[in-house]
């Protein structure tokens, strides 16, 4: 089929390929200190690392992209490491009428792939 | 809200920022000539270009990533240009029993954003 199995062993060495990494960030870092009340520090999982040929391909498009990048590196970029799923996070923030809780479904990455 | 409006004017100049571009590819280019029968040439729309700060942010996570990249460029990568949606493509391919048509929903990009 067009969708070969994604490669999961990193040919570049440990920690070099696309993976999830935790980044500590304060509300000040994010520019949110004026409206988010809690939590005051966030553990922001992010997708980092390289995407060598066919490593964790998101889908058929990513596989094609990887192949065409090999043929035309100046014209077609390599796939890059982006979230495949997210973990919801509840933030407490100020509103015009007081304080509110809101769930953000797209704030913290849960998994990564190469797209 | 945490999700500011995505910026759509490219500060780097025309054609430099994340956009959809059509790449012509033959079945030979893709390594599919042994099993795909038609179409024999594909118009593969791909996402190319840079993702300057907050340009076409996919979601809250991408905005955070952009901000943290500004603060810690060595630790947090910039968002990158990936498909936001896809156009289905029907391929005719050989099977053990003859010829089959199959729709691929994740082969050709239809829109792009910075994730």
């Amino acid at each position: 089929s067009a969708h070969a199995h994604p490669r999961d062993s990193c040919p570049l060495g440990p920690g070099r390929c696309c993976h999830l990494e935790t980044v500590q960030a304060t509300l000040e870092d994010l520019g949110w200190s004026d409206w988010v009340l809690s939590p005051r520090q966030l553990q922001l999982s992010m997708c980092v690392g390289e995407c060598p040929h066919l490593y964790r391909s998101a889908n058929t498009h990513a596989q094609i992209k990887a192949r065409l990048h090999g043929l035309q590196p100046d014209k077609v970029p390599a796939p890059c490491c982006v979230p495949s799923s997210y973990t919801p996070v509840v933030l407490m923030h100020r509103t015009d009428s007081g304080v509110s809780l809101q769930t953000y479904d797209d704030l913290v990455a849960r998994g990564c792939h190469c797209a | 809200s945490a999700h500011a409006h995505p910026r759509d004017s490219c500060p780097l100049g025309p054609g430099r920022c994340c956009h959809l571009e059509t790449v012509q590819a033959t079945l030979e280019d893709l390594g599919w000539s042994d099993w795909v029968l038609s179409p024999r040439q594909l118009q593969l729309s791909m996402c190319v270009g840079e993702c300057p700060h907050l340009y076409r942010s996919a979601n809250t996570h991408a905005q955070i990533k952009a901000r943290l990249h500004g603060l810690q460029p060595d630790k947090v990568p910039a968002p990158c240009c990936v498909p936001s949606s896809y156009t289905p493509v029907v391929l005719m391919h050989r099977t053990d029993s003859g010829v089959s048509l199959q729709t691929y929903d994740d082969l050709v990009a239809r829109g792009c954003h910075c994730a």
Epitope: - | T22, S33, D34, L37, S38, P39, R40, Q41, L42, Q43, S45, T87, P88, V89, V90, L91, M92, R94, V99, L101, T103, Y104, D105, V108, A109, R110
Partner: antibody, heavy 118, light 112 residues
């Protein structure tokens, strides 16, 4: 079952243009290519051009190059064929058909009669 | 452009009897993948064309098994094993190997 429904008959003056539409009813183009084929009265079939996903760039028969424009709007599942600088020889029934690349034209529109007459 | 030539021009048939239509191309339609890029279409009176056979010998969905396609390279044949009254119309071969797609001139099948 997807059907291709074309716009109605047109009568045009020589030198003018005509734009024929082809809408996928009961579904979308679904990843199929769209070809345009015409048939002059009492004559055979003649391919004009086609467009494949993502419907960005069309491919035209040399005979019609510069006179025909084929486009498709995925959001409305509608394809268009515009033919300019019409002459009497363009009087024909114009069909749209879906296919896989250039082959397997398995669903055809009902045809649109275009008459070019002064 | 690839030129497609059909014969005969007209074919009077008797219901229940077999019928055969020939199609010849000016260059080979056999691709290196082993498939012949030739389709057959039937246009019944007052109707749009309909697909019968694709890639030389593959019957399209819903097409009765009395229709079969054969041949390779430049010579192709459409056979109807037992003609029925509903099979009348004009049959076209079409090459899909390269653009522009080209059709044969058509063979008119009518009941004797």
């Amino acid at each position: 079952q997807v059907q291709l429904v074309q716009s109605g008959a047109e009568v045009k003056k020589p030198g003018s243009s005509v734009k024929v539409s082809c809408k996928a009813s009961g579904g979308t183009f679904g990843g199929y290519a769209i070809s345009w084929v015409r048939q002059a009265p009492g004559q055979g079939l003649e391919w004009m051009g086609g467009i494949i996903p993502p419907y960005a760039t069309a491919n035209y028969a040399q005979k019609f190059q510069g006179r025909v424009t084929i486009t498709a709007d995925e959001s409305t599942s509608t394809a268009y064929m515009e033919l300019s600088s019409l002459r009497s020889e363009d009087t024909a029934v114009y069909y749209c058909a879906r296919g896989v690349g250039t082959t397997h034209l398995d669903v055809w529109g009902q045809g649109t009669m275009v008459t070019v007459s002064s | 452009d690839i030129v497609m030539t059909q014969s005969p021009l007209s074919l009077p048939v008797t219901p229940g009897e077999p019928a055969s239509i020939s199609c010849r191309s000016s260059q080979s339609l056999l691709h290196s993948n082993g498939y012949n890029y030739l389709d057959w279409y039937l246009q019944k009176p007052g109707q749009s064309p309909q697909l019968l056979i694709y890639l030389g010998s593959n019957r399209a969905s819903g097409v009765p098994d009395r229709f079969s396609g054969s041949g390779s390279g430049t010579d192709f044949t459409l056979k109807i094993s037992r003609v029925e009254a509903e099979d009348v119309g004009v049959y076209y071969c079409m090459q899909a190997l390269q653009t522009p797609i080209t059709f044969g001139g058509g063979t008119k099948v009518e009941i004797k």
